[in-house]
Structure formats: structure tokens, C-alpha cells
Amino acid sequence: EEELQVIQPEKSVSVAAGDSATLNCTVSSLIPVGPIQWFRGAGPGRELIYNLKEGHFPRVTPVSDPTKRNNMDFSIRISNITPADAGTYYCVKFRKGSPDVELKSGAGTELSVRAKPSAPVVSGPAVRATAEHTVSFTCESHGFSPRDITLKWFKNGNELSDVQTNVDPAGKSVSYSIRSTARVVLTRRDVHSQVICEVAHVTLQGDPLRGTANLSEAIRVPPFLEVTQQSMRADNQVNVTCQVTKFYPQRLQLTWLENGNVSRTEMASALPENKDGTYNWTSWLLVNVSAHRDDVKLTCQVEHDGQPAVNKSFSVKVSAHPKEQGSNTAAENTGTNERNIY
């Protein structure tokens, strides 16, 4: 009598998550009688997946009618596949007994599950940085299988090269995660810039997933300060202007000091945006020259985005302004524009 064979024709089967997997198995004989059981894995720790005779397996259905006369097809269909179903499945013939005795196993079919990566999530630095500094962006995507995946970074459409990417775990797993860090050197023009993390995977049919981050969340553009004096007015008042330009974000407080004493404090709000995304702001201070015997030291003090204040000081020469004079005299600039303070 010819020895019974258990035939699993496919060495491997690949299925998309959510689909059904068909695992084929046929036997060469009805004899000896006894159940066919399906297991995932081999050895003592193997997991019973299906037993035609005993138990209930709601996700598993036989492909052929097992009650059909001379049925030798014990293929099964597993519904709603998830990455957790990946593994090697064995079709095993048992001889009827008390208990049933294992007779022969098929060679096994490896089920791999193609699972889509999750939408990439891009996170930027916790604190803002200024131009010429390097900031790191992180991109994460999870739950994909197989392990092969491509991740690219772009800034304003140009691929970034200072990138470090890891796929975990390194060994075999039901699903994988990717984490990538891109280092970006900021420029003053980056308020409107965007970084894109692009993930390509076999499950995406050539339509990669993208995660984005705006550099506006990561950049601080410190302001330029310029203080100028307008011409003396007929009423002996001098108009002094503090121009704060090219700053981002908008969060800014400006304080005028006269000879070191606070004269006025203003908060920037609802400013029009420049083309490059930065803001400008102009503040005026009227100084009554006739009320001063000596020169007046004016300071425009700007506190931007919680950073240390930047000062621009300026002296109004009282002696240079006879009461009747109305000419436009240039102010002496005694202040310094302290920028890039951390």
C-alpha cells in the first residue's frame, strides 16, 4: 500500500492585511482515516489553527466541502488577515485514535502579510532655532509588512541627505516600524518652507504616504532694529521712529525708555505679513525737547519670542535744536543691535 502523502504545494503565500488567505493542502489517500489539522509553527509550542472534526474556528473555512465523498482537499481559507497571522502553517494528518496520533505533516506554507504603513507623523524640534542653526525633524510610521520600505525627506521639493533611518525590529516580526531623523540647516527665508517625509512600500501601489511639517514651527527670525529721528516740529517735539523688521514669529514686545525710564510698552498684533512670511513693525515716540535741559537718551527695547531683549539706543541733542529750528537732523546712534542671543 502506497504511503500517504500530505502535499502543501505553495512554499509561501503573501496576502494583504484585511484580505483572506488560502492555504492549500491535499492528501494522497483517504487511508488511514483520521483528521487533518492545521497548525501555525512546529514543535510543542505550535498553535492549532483548524481542526475539521473538533472545535469551532470562526475565521477558518474549508475551501472544499469536507463532507464530500472521497474528499482529499483540506485547503483552508482564513478571513480578515492581520500581521499577527504571519507564520508558517502546517497541514498535519492524524490517524484516528484515542487520542489521535500524528502521522504526517506537509512541508509548510509561509504566510506573509502585506500591511500598509501608518500615515507618517513628522515632529519638529521642541524649541525654535535661528538661521544658520541645524534642527532635527523626526518621521515615524508603524505596522507595515514586509520589512522593505523606502523613506525620503524633502525640503521645498529638494531631497535632503543628512538623514538617519532605522527600521525595527531588526529580526523577523509580524510588523515593522520606521523612524527617521533629518537634519535641516535653517535660513532666514524658511518661514514658508516645508519638510516632507515620504514613505514608499509595496502595499501602497506606487502612491507613497506623506507627512509634513512647516519650518514656521521651528524657526525664529530675530528682528533688525533701526531708530531714526524725524525733523523738529514747530511745537518743539521730535518724532523718533523704531523700525523693527524681518522678524518671525509675530510675538514681540517693544518698550521705549527715556534716559533709562520706561516711557511706553507695546505688543505687536495683527501685523501684515511680508512675502517671506516675516513681519515688520514701526513704533513712534514724540519727545518734547523743551522739557529737557540735557540731551535725551532714547532706547528702543525689543523682546522677541521670549528671547533676551535687543536694544537700540539713540541720543537726542537738545543743544542742537534751537526752539525755532524745524530742520530734519540725523540722530546719533549709540545703541547696538544685539541679535542671535540664546
Epitope: I31, K53, E54, G55, D65, P66, T67, K68, N70
Partner: antibody, heavy 121, light 111 residues
Framework: EVKLEESGGGLMQPGGSMKLSCVAS????????MNWVRQSPEKGLEWVAE??????????HYAESVKGRFTISRDDSKSSVYLQMNNLRAEDTGIYYC????????????WGQGTTLTVSS | DIVLTQSPASLAVSLGQRATISCRAS??????????MYWYQQKPGQPPKLLIY???NLESGVPARFSGSGSGTDFTLNIHPVEEEDAATYYC?????????FGGGTKLEIK
Amino acid sequence: EVKLEESGGGLMQPGGSMKLSCVASGFTFSNYWMNWVRQSPEKGLEWVAEIRLKSNNYATHYAESVKGRFTISRDDSKSSVYLQMNNLRAEDTGIYYCIRDYDYDAYFDYWGQGTTLTVSS
Amino acid sequence: DIVLTQSPASLAVSLGQRATISCRASKSVSTSGYNYMYWYQQKPGQPPKLLIYLASNLESGVPARFSGSGSGTDFTLNIHPVEEEDAATYYCQHSGELPYTFGGGTKLEIK
């Protein structure tokens, strides 16, 4: 351990009705075809009826001698199979066995101890 | 219906000898290379017990002194060497087609 336990037998008059029950244990009842076979000194062993699985739409088959009079049914939730017998005749007298079909081929591997039906006036 | 005829109706065999029981079907019970014939043993007050399935295969737990053979319409049950506990009535049964039928039985007596 596989067990099949019949009940419901007794003495009946011709033309009467009776329902036999069989409770199964020790195996996944819903996965097996079930049968009734009867035995009498006159006719020996005689297959009576078979009921298949839910996946077979609970298909039933009967011996010609009982067709139209007997009805086999099952309740998988109770691991039970039944034989409703109407219009009973003297020749229906015998021991009725509840049987598990192991391999969907009248492979009668487990039999109950039987319940006796006597049809007599 | 397929009629199964068993012979002899009864036989007496000495302890340790061979008992041979025949079962003839009125029509072939073989399909696709398989012989749909079964053999049972029944002792008084007990239900039948399956011995042989598909003509020649020993049911689990049945002693190897029981064997079956045959194909098509002619089938044989052999018991060798016969033991005292083998005294019983033996039945053949087919599942070649519906309805399933049984042979009339062979009563084995041990001498």
C-alpha cells in the same frame, strides 16, 4: 470520552407518535453527521435516517420504509439529535441506536446503548 | 437498494484457529479506488462495535488478529487466531450509496 445517550422509547399503539432523543458528549457534535439505526430479530440491523451538517443545510436522508413518517432533526446548541416517529407500525418495533458518522461515509464509529420501542395493540 | 448477503449464518471455530466470514454485495460498493465496506462485532446486550473500515483498515483500538479484504462485491472478514472473547455476531455494512444496508449477520461460536 465520546458518549451517546438515547431516550424516549417505550410501548406505543399502532398509529401513535413518539419522539426519540439522543444527547451527545465528548466531541464537537456540530461537526458530525448523525444517524439512527434500528435492530429487530425479524429485520436485523436497519439504517433509518441520517442528518448532515449546517454547512450541508442539515440535509436529511431516510430509509424507504420510514419516509414520510419519520423526521430526523438536530439541535447543535444542545448537542442533540432527534427522531420524530408518526403513524407507528408494528414493524417499527426494535432497539433504536443513535450513531455518530465519523468520516461522512456511514463510518459508524460510536453507537449509543439504544432505546427500545415496542409498537403493539 | 444494495443487498448484502453474509455467509455462513453461523460458524464454530476452535480457539486459536481462523474464522472466515464472507459478505457479498448485490452491486459494487467500490468507487474511486475505495471499497465502502465496514465490519462490526456485536455481543449480546451491547451495540455493534466497528472493527474494519473501507474493507481492509483496522479501526483504532481493534486487535490486529482482525483483518478485512476484498473489493467490488466480495468481501471477507478474517479472525486469526480466534480467542474466546471473539464469540459474537458479526455484520458487514456498506456505504456505497444510499440507503446504507447491513448484512444479516454471522454468529461465531468458539469451540
